[in-house]
């Protein structure tokens, strides 16, 4: 038959490169199934382990004291034992639904007073970002991420990201990193594909959690932190990179089908702890210009 001389003409369905989206989704699914599956199927036990490792197998409440006065440099200690049985409200304290034993990022439960705990002070600014338009029925919930509620409100010059760390003895640490950055936290700000740098001026406060007998469920293959099958550690993708790696434009609202392509990558990124900063036991030191604080969602 005649050989075509035309260029690759991707199947651009609703503005996305479907071939790239499908293959990238399959890649992330393969990573997950390699860790938790058997013969390309996921048993209930494997699925349970996956949920445990991404921290959404059960709900526990911990109380995190946040510094809303951005000039204070002292450490905040959260007494998880003392406050574990009652709600404790003040204008400087917020309650975050984290599974304390899992020491990594979590998908927060929508059932647990999400709005009461973390009111969205930016809800009137949806028009600033083209992704917030209602095109194709897309609607971005403001509290899709468990880390969205770290601060009651985010100032124009600072972003706080809460991440978990672990050390070999089993002590859990909560690390709060505040770093200068103009603009708002995603989902309002999706246009920037470059994550903010954590500079030497960043303040790092570590909250030591209690020792616990509960441990993170290990995946079948024994992966823990960089458990991806590649030799290179998995990169932490922010919103823009997640979209572009699936052949999706960063200015186009997502519909449900398109979001479906992204789901394995999001789960894989959570499970591989790609967006956690692993500091040494002795001190939470972040050399200037070395690490970057990556905000995935």
């Amino acid at each position: 038959f005649p050989q075509t001389t035309e260029k690759i003409s991707p199947n651009w369905e609703s503005g996305i490169n479907v071939d790239l989206a499908i293959s990238t989704r399959q890649y992330h699914l393969q990573q997950l199934f390699y860790r938790y599956g058997e013969n390309n199927s996921l048993s209930v036990e494997g699925f349970r382990k996956l949920l445990q490792n991404i921290g959404i197998d059960k709900i526990k409440r911990i109380h995190i004291h946040h510094d809303h006065d951005h000039h204070s440099d002292h450490e905040h200690h959260s007494d998880h034992e003392r406050h574990s049985d009652h709600e404790h409200h003040s204008e400087h304290e917020h309650h975050s639904d984290h599974d304390h034993h899992s020491h990594h990022n979590h998908a927060a439960s929508g059932k647990n007073k999400r709005k009461a705990l973390c009111p969205d002070h930016d809800s009137d600014s949806s028009g600033k970002d083209p992704r917030n338009s209602q095109g194709k029925g897309a609607h971005r919930p403001e509290h899709a991420s468990g880390r969205r509620n770290v601060k009651d409100s985010v100032s124009a010059s600072e972003v706080t990201s809460t991440v978990y760390n672990t050390v070999s003895e089993g002590t859990h640490f909560l690390e709060t990193i505040e770093t200068p950055r103009p603009g708002k936290l995603f989902p309002k700000d999706v246009s920037s594909s470059t994550p903010p740098s954590v500079t030497s001026k960043s303040r790092v406060s570590r909250l030591a959690g209690r020792k616990t007998n509960e441990s993170v469920s290990e995946p079948r293959k024994g992966f823990m932190y960089s458990r991806n099958t590649n030799e290179n550690p998995q990169e932490c993708f922010n919103a823009s990179k997640l979209l572009t790696s699936h052949g999706m434009g960063i200015q186009v609202p997502l519909n449900a089908t398109e979001f479906n392509y992204l789901c394995p990558a999001i789960i894989n990124q959570i499970d591989a702890r790609s967006c956690l900063i692993h500091t040494s036991e002795k001190k939470a030191e972040i050399p200037p210009k070395t690490y970057s604080l990556q905000i995935a969602w």
Epitope: T4, E6, K7, I8, S9, P10, N11, E13, N17, V18, D19, L20, I22, S23, T24, Q26, Y27, L29, Q30, N40, N230, N232, E235, K241, T244, S245, G247, T257, N260
Partner: antibody
């Protein structure tokens, strides 16, 4: 015109390593995964693995883990496959291909013949 | 991995006569968007493989309409309404539902 231009025939000794290249032209290299396929003489097609040049994610057929290593240099629009610890079983034609699922076009390189012989 | 099983192994057909090749997958190739990721390829003697059909039944550019693909789920068929001399070679089905990609063992079409 889209082309996947592969490096020429390779003769190698058992135990050696070789690097096969695949230069893409006519499309944006970072828009598609690049796949590698093995075909032994008189045999069928066997998928080795694939790389996404946009971020160098790689996925392998378990059979070829440790045997093949895929890399890509986006500035040169070129994908590479390293084959190590060669044996006679590695003698085959190796193809790079876009192996597309939904697009109306699909592209294959002309193949690189590897002969492993002492 | 998804196992792709092709039959027959060899097909001898007279020019102008129809031909049919079957491909069965060990699991459904239906994707979450409702489309089925199955390709058919032809490898002529001494050449690289070339895709003929994608998404079960869509013809690649330049592929004659005497080729038709059909099927769903796990059972697929490639038909050639009237075989021509240039059709000889080995036909492969290939699944695109997951990594690793897998191919059928091939069906060799010979001209009687």
């Amino acid at each position: 015109e889209v082309q996947l231009q592969q490096s020429g025939t390779v003769l190698a000794r058992p135990g050696a390593s070789v690097k096969i290249s695949c230069k893409a032209s006519g499309y944006r290299f970072t828009s598609y995964w690049m796949h590698w396929v093995k075909q032994r003489p008189g045999q069928g097609l066997e998928w080795i693995g694939a790389i996404y040049p946009g971020n160098s994610d790689t996925t392998y057929n378990q059979k070829f883990k440790g045997k093949a290593k895929l890399t890509a240099v986006t500035s040169a629009s070129t994908a590479y496959m390293d084959l190590s610890s060669l044996t006679n079983e590695d003698s085959a034609v190796y193809y790079c291909t876009s192996l597309l699922l939904r697009s109306p076009f699909d592209y294959w390189g002309q193949g690189t013949t590897l002969t492993v012989s002492s | 991995d998804v196992v792709m099983t092709q039959t027959p192994l060899t097909l001898s057909v007279t020019i102008g006569q129809p031909a049919s090749i079957s491909c069965k997958s060990s699991q459904s190739l239906l994707d979450s968007d409702g489309k089925t990721n199955l390709n058919w390829l032809l490898q002529r003697p001494g050449q690289s493989p070339k895709r003929l059909i994608y998404l079960v039944s869509k013809l690649d550019s330049g592929v004659p309409d005497r080729f038709t693909g059909s099927g769903s789920g796990t059972d697929f068929t490639l038909k050639i309404s009237r075989v021509e001399a240039e059709d000889l070679g080995v036909y492969y089905c290939c699944q695109g539902i997951q990594f690793p990609r897998t191919f059928g063992g091939g069906t060799k079409l010979e001209i009687k």
